[in-house]
């Protein structure tokens, strides 16, 4: 913490300006009034403060706003945002997308994924839902940031907004997030024709259940291996060799290249070797001929 001293009369600060860059940390602490700083936050980012001086300014704001900064201050944080921790940001209430844009721009190129994720979370909470304007802002200023939101937050996305989401925005989404987004996407694109529907739903298929994957296999979609590999393991395992062949179409030969990777490896282990041989790809590891498969989990459930 900065040591408290009295401000020398000649150093008294009446406005936030460039002269402050010559103040020592101790002088800044003693001479800058926190309320003045908050009122003139829009000037701070134009002044080339050192990181040490920014620490002092942050300390002043923290003292003035122990419950969290008001949005009027947050909007003008500029490079002071780089000093914020997720814990600081968690206290904020942000509703303005202009504020979000400003801070996303500042954070670019800095290792601030935790802070940005918390900021986006606060915006979603502040606005009440993940509306189209918020999604548009995220896709424009922070590709991939959508996936920093928890499944709970993502559940507030109305299906009507899903169309604004681009494939690259989902690149870092995990299975739990796609589980939430997939049903919304299915609803949003339900009136589209087969091929158009597949193009739109493709980035969300990591959340698709087996029934939907089976249904796609009947629609000549020729799913590429990249999409197939992103499907949930549980959705792939029940598929038959014939269904996978139909689903992948000409891309089926890619199974050979990916045979060591999950979910292909796990799927191969569940198929009869006879059936795998019909693909003519030399896939090995299926259940040998004449072997009986007992599902012990069913037996346990009955006992």
């Amino acid at each position: 913490d900065v040591e408290r001293t009295t401000c020398p009369p000649e150093k008294e600060v009446h406005e936030i300006d460039e002269s402050l860059i010559f103040y020592k940390k101790r002088e800044l602490e003693a001479c800058v009034d926190a309320a003045l700083l908050a009122a003139q936050m829009d000037r701070v980012d134009a002044i080339p403060f050192t990181y040490e001086q920014l620490d002092v300014l942050k300390h002043k704001l923290d003292e003035l706003y122990p419950q969290g900064y008001p949005e009027s201050v947050i909007r003008h944080l500029g490079h002071l945002f780089l000093k914020m921790s997720p814990e600081d940001i968690r206290k904020w209430n942000v509703t303005s997308l202009e504020t979000l844009k400003a801070l996303l721009k500042v954070s670019k190129g800095h290792e601030m994924s935790a802070q940005v994720a918390t900021l986006i979370d606060r915006v979603v909470v502040g606005r009440g839902q993940l509306d189209k304007d918020t999604v548009d802002t995220l896709t424009a200023f922070c590709p991939g940031c959508l996936c920093s939101l928890s499944p709970e937050r993502l559940s507030s996305v109305p299906p009507s907004v899903i169309g604004a989401v681009r494939p690259q925005d989902l690149d870092t989404c995990g299975p739990r997030q796609l589980d939430v987004l997939y049903p919304k996407a299915r609803l949003a694109f339900q009136n589209m024709s087969g091929s158009e529907y597949f193009v739109k739903i493709r980035p969300f298929l990591g959340g698709a259940p087996t029934e939907d994957v089976k249904a796609l296999s009947q629609q000549n979609v020729s799913m590429d291996l990249a999409t197939f590999m992103k499907l949930r393991r549980e959705a792939v395992l029940p598929l038959t060799v014939a269904e996978v062949q139909k689903l992948l179409g000409p891309h089926v030969e890619g199974l050979k290249v990916e045979e060591q990777h999950s979910p292909v490896r796990d799927w191969i282990l569940k198929q009869r070797q006879d059936d795998l041989d019909t693909l003519g790809l030399g896939l090995q590891g299926g259940i040998p001929n004449g072997y009986l498969i007992l599902d012990l989990s069913v037996r346990e459930a009955l006992s």
């Epitope: 992103k230 030969e253 290249v257 990777h261």
Partner: antibody, heavy 119, light 108 residues
Framework: EVQLVQSGAEVKKPGASVKVSCKAS????????MDWVRQAPGQGLEWMGD????????IYNQKFNGRVTMTEDKSASTVYMELSSLRSEDTAVYYC????????????WGQGTTVTVSS | EIVLTQSPATLSLSPGERATLSCSAS???????LSWYQQKPGQSPRLLIY???NLASGIPARFSGSGSGTDYTLTISSLEPEDFAVYYC?????????FGGGTKVEIK
């Protein structure tokens, strides 16, 4: 423009580890596996293994098993290859190479990272 | 593992001549799973041909590939000065993926 940018040259002592990074840009990171291929001075190419950035799943050439670890950071579109228990025979240029999932050919290569193992 | 043997190890030719490079596999390779790369000194390899005979993007038509089973060929119909380099075949038909030892095409 599709690019793979690798980290700089490294000099290591025998027994140490090295971690090489490969940052991808200009394409959908999770639609391509990232493979690692090395080339000893004046020698041919040797495939080390690959990682699926979507799942984090890896396959390693058994020759390197237990010594090589490949990881990814989706948020940074970066993959890493760490080789441990280095010996002089590991002196080589290490390349990351992009491979579209479902194909086995490498259509884009990194510029290479020279790793020198010397006591 | 499948061993790929390239021959000859060195090919000395003049610009304008035809170059024929061979790649022989120790066991059968599915033809969809063979490719060729070019590497110049101090540079990364570059994809030339994939799936035995498909030309990669930006590769001139003087390059062509053929073959099946255990025997594959890369042909350069008329050598240009920029074609003098080392060429590698590569298979991903069987794990682990392997490369041939390379053929150096040098100026005679």
């Amino acid at each position: 423009e599709v690019q793979l940018v690798q980290s700089g040259a490294e000099v290591k002592k025998p027994g140490a580890s090295v971690k090489v990074s490969c940052k991808a840009s200009g394409y959908t990171f999770t639609d391509y596996n990232m493979d690692w291929v090395r080339q000893a001075p004046g020698q041919g190419l040797e495939w080390m293994g690959d990682i699926n950035p979507s799942t984090g799943g890896t396959i390693y050439n058994q020759k390197f098993n237990g010594r090589v670890t490949m990881t990814e950071d989706k948020s940074a579109s970066t993959v890493y290859m760490e080789l441990s228990s280095l010996r002089s025979e590991d002196t080589a240029v290490y390349y990351c190479a992009r491979r579209r999932i479902g194909t086995g050919y490498f259509d884009v290569w990194g510029q290479g990272t020279t790793v020198t193992v010397s006591s | 593992e499948i061993v790929l043997t390239q021959s000859p190890a060195t090919l000395s030719l003049s610009p304008g001549e035809r170059a024929t490079l061979s790649c022989s596999a120790s066991s059968s390779v599915i033809s969809s799973y063979l490719s060729w790369y070019q590497q110049k000194p101090g540079q990364s390899p570059r994809l030339l041909i994939y799936r035995t005979s498909n030309l990669a993007s930006g590769i001139p038509a003087r390059f062509s590939g053929s073959g099946s089973g255990t025997d594959y060929t890369l042909t350069i119909s008329s050598l240009e000065p920029e074609d003098f380099a080392v060429y590698y075949c590569h298979q991903w038909s069987s794990f682990p993926y392997t490369f041939g030892g390379g053929t150096k095409v040098e100026i005679k």
